[in-house]
């Protein structure tokens, strides 16, 4: 049967304290984009105080919580995708 | 530096059973699914299935299912693959790797002789 | 299962020349996190495979830049901008986005 890599697609976590987590050849996160100027170009939190949130996933910051959010990659899961799935 | 390290080569009888090993360094043994891949004399590359270090959990592609048995030792950092009622078709290189979202690192490979 | 057509099956190139090798998926790779799971790997003569390119066109370290990877969805390319004679051997695309993993059927790489 064929079953994606992952179903755990989205969790939400509402810890504003994440601990910073290197984990050994975890993939890079993009570069950190320039400050903004005017309204609404404010950065995006996931570049830099929770560059290291997502343990194997990608973040996204959900606004409207004021919380990062972790995407997993294929296999892993939990709300920083720090679990394997099976 | 990550390294597989692969038990070496085995002869065995059609009919028999036999197990692999493939002892892992220089990452954190839980954190990373270890797969098992098939290659056939001048074949291509068949993936056989993965087991969680954590639990011993694992998935099977359906080709495999009653052919292979994925174990793991995580107190030796090792992960193990049975191969069972052996013939000729299952005459290979068997690779251990870890294969995951950022890259891949593979064992040297086992090579299995299937002969009477 | 997922299909991973590879072309074409073997490849006789110049030392100097360019190299072009084709991958195509039976499914879109696309993954929820918006990546594209797609590798490529090179198997040199009585060596274990070594992998090249992950998530379509991202370099693994130490790879040296001639290679790139590039495409998208269903359709992916590997390409090296001046072939070298250590880059001899079979060049695989694998799948990481479902299981199970499928790899390509190979693509030979010869050195004319």
């Known amino acids: 049967d064929l079953q994606e890599a992952d179903l755990d697609l989205l969790r939400v976590t509402l810890s504003s304290k994440p601990q910073a987590l290197a984990t050994p050849n975890k993939e890079e996160h993009g570069k950190r984009k320039k400050k903004g100027k005017g309204l609404g170009k404010k950065r995006d939190p996931c570049l830099r105080k929770y560059k290291d949130f997502c343990i194997h996933g990608e973040c996204k910051y959900v606004k409207e919580l004021r919380a990062p959010s972790c995407i997993c990659h294929p296999g892993y899961h939990g709300e920083r995708c720090h679990g394997l799935s099976l | 530096e990550v390294q597989l390290q692969q038990s070496g080569p085995e002869l065995m009888k059609p009919g028999a059973s036999v197990k692999m090993s493939c002892k892992a360094s220089?990452?954190?043994?839980?954190?990373?699914?270890m797969n098992w891949v098939k290659q056939s004399h001048g074949k291509s590359l068949e993936w056989i299935g993965r087991?969680?270090?954590?639990?011993?959990?694992?998935s099977y592609s359906q080709k495999f299912k009653d052919k292979a048995t994925l174990t793991v030792d995580k107190s030796l950092n090792t992960a193990y693959m049975q191969v069972n009622s052996l013939t000729s078709e299952d005459s290979a290189v068997y690779y251990c790797?870890?294969?995951?979202?950022?890259?891949?690192?593979w064992g040297q490979g086992t090579t299995l002789t299937v002969s009477s | 299962e997922i299909v991973m057509t590879q072309t074409p099956l073997s490849l006789s190139v110049t030392i100097g020349q360019p190299a072009s090798i084709s991958c195509k998926s039976s499914?879109?790779?696309?993954?929820?996190?918006?990546?594209?799971?797609l590798n490529w790997l090179q198997q040199r003569p009585g060596q274990a495979p070594k992998h090249l390119m992950y998530?379509?066109?991202k370099l693994v370290p130490g790879i040296p830049d001639r290679f790139s990877g590039s495409g998208s969805e269903t359709d992916f390319t590997l390409k090296i901008s001046r072939v070298e004679a250590e880059d001899l051997g079979v060049y695989y695309c694998?799948?990481?986005?479902?299981?199970?993993?499928?790899f390509g059927s190979g693509t030979k790489l010869e050195i004319k």
């Open positions: 499914q879109s790779l696309l993954y929820t996190t918006g990546k594209t799971y």
């Open positions: 220089g990452y954190i043994f839980t954190d990373y699914y």
């Open positions: 998530q379509v066109s």
């Open positions: 087991v969680n270090p954590n639990n011993g959990g694992t």
């Open positions: 694998l799948q990481g986005t479902y299981y199970p993993h499928t």
């Open positions: 790797a870890r294969i995951y979202y950022g890259g891949s690192d």
